[in-house]
Structure formats: C-alpha cells, structure tokens
Interface confidence: low
C-alpha cells in the first residue's frame, strides 16, 4: 500500500501526491481561526493499474487541483488530521483534531 | 451542458447526480452553527464520453460517496451555495453564502 510523491518539476505522469498549501482565507472559510493556511497536498495524474485503494471521503476536504482534469480519478487513499482552532455550535472556541485534512498518499479509485 | 439525475432505485450506470444529506455534526465540523445538515447531493457512476465539463473545485467541499469507487471520476460540474451561520476569523458570527456546497449537475473529468 504505497503512493508516489511528486513536485511541480516532476515528469511523473502517473497518479501522484503533489504539494499544495490550502489558504482558508482565500477559500472563504474564515470561521477557522487557526491555522489560516496549511500544507494539504493533493492528488493528480493518470490512473493505470496501480494504487487501487480509495480513501473514503467522509469529511469536507479541499479539491483544488491545479494540474487539470485528470485529478478527480486520482484520489487520496490515506489522510491525516490537523489541529485546528475553530468555533463550535455552543459558541465556544475549540482546539481540536480535524480528521482527513492532509493527503498522505494518493491512489486510483 | 447537462447531467443525469438519479436516485437510489435507479438502474443508470453512467455518471449521475444522487441525493445525499450531509450532516455536519456527524462529520465533526461543529464550528458550523447552522444548518446542522443540508441536501448536498453527490456524483457517482461510470464515465464514458459524456459530461465532459469539470467544475473547478475552489473550496472545501464534501466528497462523501456511498456508491463506491467509481465516484471520483464522476464529479460536480455545476454547484451552488447555501446560506450558513458560521464563525469567521475576526471572531464574529457571520450569516453568509458559502459557495460550492450543493451539487446541481454531475459530469466526467
């Protein structure tokens, strides 16, 4: 169970994990107090016969994919949480772990 | 520019929009004060040669897809906002339109 890591200079065409910083302010999600931005990563590339595991997306996660239309078939298969400071429904500021916010591994579904 | 609408009883195998209610509390996104749940819809199905337009995901959007692994290739091509009560980075409770929260149309990328 593995996945490729790439960067913007990579020539890899297969499904790969790329670095991406999500800026909550830019996306309009400004009820998040902290962090204002974080390294989320994203998946992009061609899907052939590898990376068959698909991570079940059970949370709101960012899908910004600057590498184009191949992205949606190449999806996260392992994700991890980040600690966030946010506002809860009881009008309290909460510090907690929000699951499935960082892409650790990519694969094809 | 069009898309298919299906429901849980549908025999359609192609990329289609299905009804789905997102429950923010269940997903742990409890800094959203209201609504606690809303009709988000989702995309699922096989992608052949139709529905070529891909919606550019520029916001954190829910990707829960109970119909399985075909989902990521079949993505929203038109989305609309919902009004939400939420907490912003200036520590104010805001009533605002959050974009790209409801799937109006599905297509293949």
């Amino acid at each position: 169970d593995f996945g490729l890591d790439c960067d913007e200079h990579s020539t890899e065409s297969r499904c790969c994990r790329y670095p991406l910083t999500v800026d909550f302010e830019a996306f309009g999600w400004d009820w998040i107090i902290a962090p204002k931005r974080y390294k989320a990563n994203y998946c992009s590339g061609e899907c052939e016969f590898v990376f068959l595991q698909k991570y079940p997306h059970t949370h709101l996660v960012h899908q910004a994919n600057p590498r184009g239309s191949a992205g949606p078939c190449c999806t996260p298969t392992k994700m991890s949480p980040i600690n966030m400071l946010y506002f809860n429904g009881k009008e309290q500021i909460i510090y907690g772990k929000i699951p499935a916010m960082v892409v650790d591994r990519c694969g094809c579904s | 520019d069009f898309g298919l609408d299906c429901d849980e009883h549908s025999t359609e195998s192609r990329c289609c929009r299905y009804p789905l209610t997102v429950d923010f509390e269940a997903f742990g996104w409890d800094w959203i004060i209201a609504p606690k749940r809303y009709k988000a819809n989702y995309c699922s199905g096989e992608c052949e040669f139709v529905f070529l337009q891909k919606y550019p995901h520029t916001h954190l959007v829910h990707q829960a897809n109970p119909r399985g692994s075909a989902g990521p290739c079949c993505t929203p091509t038109k989305m609309s906002p919902i009004n939400m009560l939420y907490f912003n980075g200036k520590e104010q409770i805001i009533y605002g339109k959050i974009p790209a929260m409801v799937v109006d149309r599905c297509g293949c990328s």
């Epitope: 009008e91 | 609504p35 009560l85 339109k97």
Partner: antibody, heavy 124, light 107 residues
Framework: QVQLVQSGAEVKKPGASVKVSCKAS????????MHWVRQAPGQGLEWIGN????????NYNQRFKARATLTTDTSTSTAYMELRSLRSDDTAVYYC?????????????????WGQGTLVTVSS | DIQMTQSPSSLSASVGDRVTITCKAS??????LSWFQQKPGKAPKSLIY???RLVDGVPSKFSGSGSGQDYTLTISSLQPEDFATYYC?????????FGQGTKLEIK
C-alpha cells in the same frame, strides 16, 4: 428566570464619559452574545455593537467604534457599555439585549431578553 | 450600511382590523429580518425572526413574509394591546440596522 438588570439613569456633561452596566442572571452568561442598542427620545432604534462574554470579542457599529467600548466581567455576569466624548445627541435610552440562538437555520436568532433600559442625558 | 425603510411611518386602525406594515432593504438581505413591538417607556419585544418565524409565546395573529429586499408584518385582527410602535431589523450584515418605526394608533 432570565433577567437583565441595567444601572440607573445618568446625567452627564458634554465631553464626559458614561458607563452603563447590564447584570445578567438566570443563565450561563458566557454562552450568549450581548448586544447594545440605543434609542434617542422619540426616535428609532440604533445598534451599537455586541460582545461575546466567553472571550470578550466585540463587534461595533462603525459610527460608535471610536467612542464606545463594550466589556464584560464574567465573575459578576455583567456587561458594560462605555461611551466617551459625549454629545447632546447621545441623549438616549441605552438597552442591553441577549441574543438567543434558536438553532435551526442560518439566522435563527432573536433578542429574547432585554434590559429595562438606562436613560443617559447629556446636557450642559 | 444597509438602509431599512419602513412604511407607513404611522397608521390609524380600529380594533379587529387587519394591518400590514412593510420594510424595504437597500439590498437583498436574504430573509434575515426581524420584527419588534415597542410600547412607550418599555423595551422592544421580539415578534418575528428570519422574516416569517414566530418567536415562542407570540400570538399567531402576528405573521411575517417577504424575501429579497421587501418584507411585511401583518397583524390579522387588532386588539387594544397591539397599538404600539413596530420596528424591523436586518441581521444580514454588520452593522445591524433598524427601520425607522411604524406607530400604530387607535382610530
């Protein structure tokens, strides 16, 4: 029962400051936003701002931002509205009001409890 | 700031009458509108929130409607205790802004 009791009437000279108090009882003070609204004699209602006692965060109407300060004392469950550099047109009844969140939709709140009002008269 | 224009500014009516007060916003306020009743020397009392939802304990003779920029408060059958001044409030945007009020008097 939930109650907001405000301080008594004040008479101030132009240029002075006034600090109106609003003592809450019958509920968890830190969990609800407190709003301040004023009403000049024979006039309409004007929103001054609000404060969240849990963390002291406040929001102001820009018209009052330079002169008004909203604070809270959680140990006594009291909210305060201070207005500086008073002018004759600040003569008004000042109200505190609790924002009650009903919790079923994006703007489901209303002012469910008001203080009795504090008349501030500014006169030379 | 969003301007709220209430009309009429005063209104004479008789017991049993049905009356309508309107409030127009300077922009779309997404139904984030409340209505208040105020009697002389008293604090305002909330009647309606979110344009058409009745506050707990408020009689059903009060109703609200509208969307976008235009909203109305209707009192279906006036009783002596209903003669008062009524205000609208928009909560779509800070600063919150009130209408100038409608004084409802006995004819």
């Amino acid at each position: 029962q939930v109650q907001l009791v405000q301080s008594g009437a004040e008479v101030k000279k132009p240029g002075a400051s006034v600090k109106v108090s609003c003592k809450a009882s019958g509920y968890s003070f830190t969990g609800y936003f407190m709003h301040w609204v004023r009403q000049a004699p024979g006039q309409g209602l004007e929103w001054i701002g609000n404060i969240y006692p849990y963390n002291g965060v406040s929001n102001y109407n820009q018209r009052f931002k330079a002169r008004a300060t909203l604070t809270t004392d959680t140990s006594t469950s009291t909210a305060y509205m201070e207005l500086r550099s008073l002018r004759s047109d600040d003569t008004a009844v000042y109200y505190c009001a609790r924002r009650y969140y009903y919790g079923t939709g994006p703007a489901d709140w209303y002012y469910d409890v008001w203080g009795q009002g504090t008349l501030v008269t500014v006169s030379s | 700031d969003i301007q709220m224009t209430q009309s009429p500014s005063s209104l004479s009516a008789s017991v049993g009458d049905r009356v309508t007060i309107t409030c127009k916003a300077s922009q779309d306020i997404n139904s984030y509108l409340s209505w208040f009743q105020q009697k002389p020397g008293k604090a305002p009392k909330s009647l309606i929130y979110r344009a058409n939802r009745l506050v707990d304990g408020v009689p059903s003779k009060f109703s609200g409607s509208g969307s976008g920029q235009d909203y109305t408060l209707t009192i279906s059958s006036l009783q002596p205790e209903d003669f008062a001044t009524y205000y609208c409030l928009q909560s779509d945007e800070f600063p919150l802004t009130f209408g100038q009020g409608t004084k409802l008097e006995i004819k």
